[in-house]
């Protein structure tokens, strides 16, 4: 019961979270004007990975496509490019994420079969989450070195009278979506992973018949057996098996099983 | 068509205050700004302040912050531009000019001629 | 605050000539988000209210003669009146609302030589 509650939120979490990379990659507000030197603006600029828009204080707001590709920065592009291989790989991982959930059957899918979907797509999940992750943080670090390179243009080179002042910008919602976004496409990888463990049993259950010599009784237990011997101590080739009323998933248990999450 | 009627011709004494009125027509008076610009006898415009009758918010100008005062009432469609403690120096012609896109005054009201004399 | 300068501050040209005012702002009025520049000019007739005549620098308002235009970018604006005519007598100002407060240049008195 366990391993499918750990798959079922894996699932669950990882939708959200590509959900989220997918929210933040079509959002606008990647960067926005920094307010710190003038907090009532006419003009409010933001951009994002696709286009770039201004907010008057009129009420209206208007949006301008970035229609170039080459001139474009390298790191932009190099963002999108993260953000999509995320956005893909995680849809790619929900698909085959689906099909490997305990609660789904299909056809007389095996165990092993599930198990190995669970674990493609947990680390399809990873790694999407990583993507993001990475993809947001560059933009982020791009963000923070022209921040700081247009606040020394600010102090310097203000001797004429006019004031070529740059519009600083600052992190805007669709970073801190993405991050979060990408931590939770990670942690549900990371749950899908653990619930592999415990869908794929490492060693198999060999529920055939013992036969021993004549002459010596063999007491069965139900669910599975326990050979004992009347000479009660060799067992030393023999598997032992707890024949209490344990769920198919927990035919492994792991202790410290969840310390991952 | 949009349309901004203002209140007639004041005269004052100093130190004591005006109220001038703006009636807008036309238009979805809720949803815009609304500006008051004055122009002093020979000289320039100067921006007052503004008000969104939607949600009462505003801005003013640093010069005018600590007299004027904006509000609106949507019921009537009427903006309100108070100037209290009044000086010589306030004698003007005070507009009224609805704020549009592109940050523009596109239309404005005909103007209120308001004097200020001991 | 952002200033406006206008140059210059009266100006008188014959009729059918052209005309040009300047307006020199004390910062950018270039929009990073969109690549406008919100500069506006007002033509203010006597005893009138002003009327608005273009803006975003160069977008020209519904109804007003296409021998009005503006040009400039970043500091430096004209406004041009290709070939005047007689009720294009006026004071014109320029208006930044790129931010606040919103101010307005001092003006130019255009005058019929």
């Known amino acids: 019961m366990a391993v499918t509650a750990c798959q079922g939120l894996g699932f669950v979490v990882s939708l959200i979270g590509i959900a989220g990379i997918i929210a933040a990659t079509c959002m606008d507000q990647w960067s926005t004007q920094d307010l710190y030197n003038n907090p009532v603006t006419a003009v409010f600029n933001y951009q994002g990975l696709w286009r770039s828009c201004v907010r008057e204080s009129s009420g209206f707001t208007e949006c301008r496509g970035y229609f170039t590709l080459l001139g474009l920065p390298a790191m932009l592009q190099a963002v999108r490019a993260l953000m999509i291989v995320g956005i893909v790989l995680g849809a790619i991982g929900l698909l085959v994420s689906i099909f490997a959930l305990k609660c789904i059957r299909i056809g007389s899918m095996e165990d092993s079969a599930k198990a190995n979907m669970t674990l493609t797509s947990g680390i399809m999940f990873i790694v999407s989450g990583l993507c993001a992750i990475a993809g947001v943080s560059v933009f982020a670090n791009m963000l923070v070195t022209n921040f700081w390179m247009s606040t020394a243009n600010m102090y310097t080179g203000m001797g004429g009278m006019v004031q070529t002042v740059q519009t600083r910008y600052t992190f805007g919602a669709a970073l801190f979506v993405g991050w979060v976004a990408g931590g939770l496409t990670l942690i549900g990888g990371v749950m899908m992973c653990i619930a592999c463990r415990g869908l794929a049993p490492e060693e198999t259950n060999y529920k055939a018949v013992s036969y021993h010599a004549s002459g010596h009784s063999v007491a069965y237990k139900p669910g599975g057996f326990k050979a004992s011997t009347g000479f009660g101590s060799n067992t030393k080739n023999k598997k032992i098996y707890d024949g209490g009323a344990r769920t198919e998933d927990e035919v492994q248990s792991y202790p410290s099983k969840h310390d991952y999450v | 068509q949009v349309q901004l009627v203002q209140s007639g011709a004041e005269v004052k004494k100093p130190g004591s205050s005006v109220k001038v009125s703006c009636k807008a027509s036309?238009?979805?008076?809720?949803?815009?700004?609304m500006n008051w610009v004055r122009q002093a006898p020979g000289q320039g415009l100067e921006w007052m302040g503004q008000?969104?009758?939607?949600?009462?918010?505003?801005k003013y100008s640093g010069k005018f912050q600590s007299r004027v005062t904006i509000t609106a009432d949507k019921s009537t469609n009427t903006a309100y531009m108070e100037l209290s403690s009044l000086r010589s120096e306030d004698t003007a012609v005070y507009y009224c000019a609805r704020f549009y896109y592109g940050n523009v005054m596109d239309y404005w009201g005909q103007g209120t001629l308001v004097t200020v004399s001991s | 605050d952002i200033v406006l300068t206008q140059s210059p501050d009266s100006l008188a040209v014959s009729l059918g000539e052209r005309a040009t005012i300047n307006c020199k702002s004390s910062?950018?009025?270039?929009?990073?988000?969109?690549?406008?520049?919100?500069l506006t000019w007002y033509q203010q007739k006597p005893g009138q209210p002003p009327k608005l005549l273009i803006y975003w620098a160069s977008t020209r308002e519904s109804g007003v003669p296409d021998r009005f235009s503006g040009s400039g970018s970043g500091t430096d604006f004209t406004l041009t009146i290709s070939s005047l005519q007689a009720e294009d007598l006026a004071v014109y100002y320029c208006?930044?609302?790129?931010?606040?407060?919103?101010?307005f240049g001092q003006g130019t008195k255009l005058e019929i030589k």
């Open positions: 036309g238009y979805a008076f809720s949803n815009y700004w």
């Open positions: 910062q950018t009025l270039l929009s990073g988000g969109n690549q406008k520049n919100y």
């Open positions: 208006q930044q609302g790129y931010s606040y407060p919103l101010t």
């Open positions: 008000i969104y009758p939607g949600s009462g918010d505003t």
